[in-house]
Interface confidence: low
């Protein structure tokens, strides 16, 4: 038999597991698809992003509703010959999530 | 030109992506390579884990010092023959992370 | 506050190098999108960028004086270093530090060098 | 190298006039990222350059309103709508958008 207390311990765990925004840092250069010359410092930023865990295999945690955020960041051009510019990056942050299922896939891709 | 406020936004915003033992979601299956007619209930639990943000593009986020803590969980077998099993599971939790060198390539890989 | 301050001598022979040192405060070399340079004005005449040096150590020289020129940083002491060999009479001007911003916001006093023997 | 070309040299201005200073550039001043890194300084006698207009129209902060710039590509103007007496020293505009950052030659803004 299981005591009830440990029952609630396993659950509190689970619900801190499930599908929902989380901080997350994300590297703004990949994420803006910028140009090798060009980076940013820093090079991450937090922002929420849907993670953590669904009940079935076939789900998968995904953003239901988005919002865009904006970071300041030195954008620096590769060689150093200007001065580094602060610019306002908008990176998105996610604001819903929810398990769904994987996009099916075509039986000859 | 920057103004000191700004920089220090920016410097804090930095702080917090830098690499550092972060609560993950961690797949309790995966995590301990069992067969596939093994499964935990929760399949997740929350774990500390190396991530963030390493100055350098040669570096990554690796931990350095590692303990193992117990959670209990339901071990399900598949077919249900007996009874949903508590057991303690033990898994990793990063204490200590670093950004260090990623491995050296061999020249032919 | 941000502030600059030159230091080297005033006089300097013909063909000697010239070591200036730049002590700033109000700001940290380690912060990212910092740089400190040196600009210098001969008397009468206008302003000529010499260098600069970024917080990451990368450095950019005016092509025109690149040869001739060394800028350097100690980022636990605040300062920066420029050094300009084989100096001549027409290098004689107050040379700046300044605080590598777009555009130069922080400027330092100036000190005025004389080359003469 | 960018030539950054001011006219008049020297300007004598008298208290309470608008007074005009040109800049001419060699090439565009308009850099990869839309920005035009023009700026406008004032060095008054015995100091160091202070300044006073950034990005070709935004007046540093502490500046008074009656100094304002325009312009775009190659061309750009300083004007001081009433002049005072305090407005006295040599003018300079400077470009940062191509290296090396050059300064113009200066215009000397005396009272009669």
């Known amino acids: 038999f299981y005591d009830i207390e440990t029952l609630k311990v396993i659950d509190e765990e689970w619900q801190r597991t499930q599908c929902s925004p989380r901080e997350t840092c994300v590297e703004v250069a990949s994420e803006l698809g910028k140009s090798t010359n060009t980076f940013f410092k820093p090079p991450c930023v937090n922002v929420f992003r849907c993670g953590g865990c669904c009940n079935e295999e076939s789900l998968i945690c995904m953003n239901t509703s988005t919002s865009y955020i904006s970071k300041q960041l030195f954008e620096i051009s590769v060689p150093l010959t200007s001065v580094p510019e602060l610019v306002p990056v908008k990176v998105a942050n996610h604001t819903g999530c929810k398990c769904l299922p994987t996009a099916p896939r075509h039986p000859y891709s | 030109f920057y103004d000191i406020e700004t920089l220090k936004v920016i410097d804090e915003e930095w702080q917090r992506t830098q690499c550092s033992p972060r609560e993950t979601c961690v797949e309790v299956a995966s995590e301990l390579g069992k067969s596939t007619n093994t499964f935990f209930k929760p399949p997740c639990v929350n774990v500390f884990r190396c991530g963030g943000c390493c100055n350098e593009e040669s570096l990554i986020c690796m931990n350095t010092s590692t303990s193992y803590i117990s959670k209990q969980l339901f071990e399900i077998s598949v077919p249900l023959t007996s009874v949903p099993e508590l057991v303690p599971v033990k898994v990793a939790n990063h204490t200590g992370c670093k950004c260090l060198p990623t491995a050296p390539r061999h020249p032919y890989s | 506050q941000v502030t600059l301050k030159e230091s080297g001598p005033a006089l300097v022979k013909p063909t000697q190098t010239l070591t200036l040192t730049c002590t700033f405060s109000?700001?940290?070399?380690?912060?990212?999108?910092?740089?400190v340079g040196w600009i210098r004005q001969p008397p009468g005449k206008a302003l000529e960028w010499l260098a600069n040096i970024w917080w990451n150590d990368d450095k950019y020289y005016n092509p025109v004086l690149r040869s001739r020129l060394t800028i350097s940083k100690d980022t636990s002491k605040n300062q920066v270093v420029l050094t300009m060999t084989n100096m001549d009479p027409v290098d004689t001007a107050t040379y700046y530090c300044v605080q590598v911003t777009n555009p130069f916001v922080f400027w330092g006093q100036g000190t005025l060098v004389t080359v003469s023997s | 190298d960018i030539v950054m070309t001011q006219t008049p040299l020297s300007l004598p201005v008298t208290p309470g006039e608008p007074a005009s200073i040109s800049c001419r550039s060699s090439q565009s001043l308009v850099h990869i990222n839309g920005n035009t890194y023009l700026h406008w300084y004032l060095q008054k006698p015995g100091q160091s350059p202070q300044l006073l207009i950034y990005k070709v129209s935004n007046r540093f902060s502490g500046v008074p309103d009656r100094f304002s710039g325009s312009g775009s590509g190659t061309d750009f103007t300083l004007k001081i709508s009433r002049v005072e007496a305090e407005d006295v020293g040599v003018y300079f505009c400077?470009?940062?958008?191509?290296?090396?950052?050059?300064f113009g030659g200066g215009t000397k803004v005396e009272i009669k």
């Open positions: 400077s470009q940062s958008t191509h290296v090396p950052w050059t």
């Open positions: 109000g700001f940290s070399l380690s912060d990212y999108g910092m740089g």
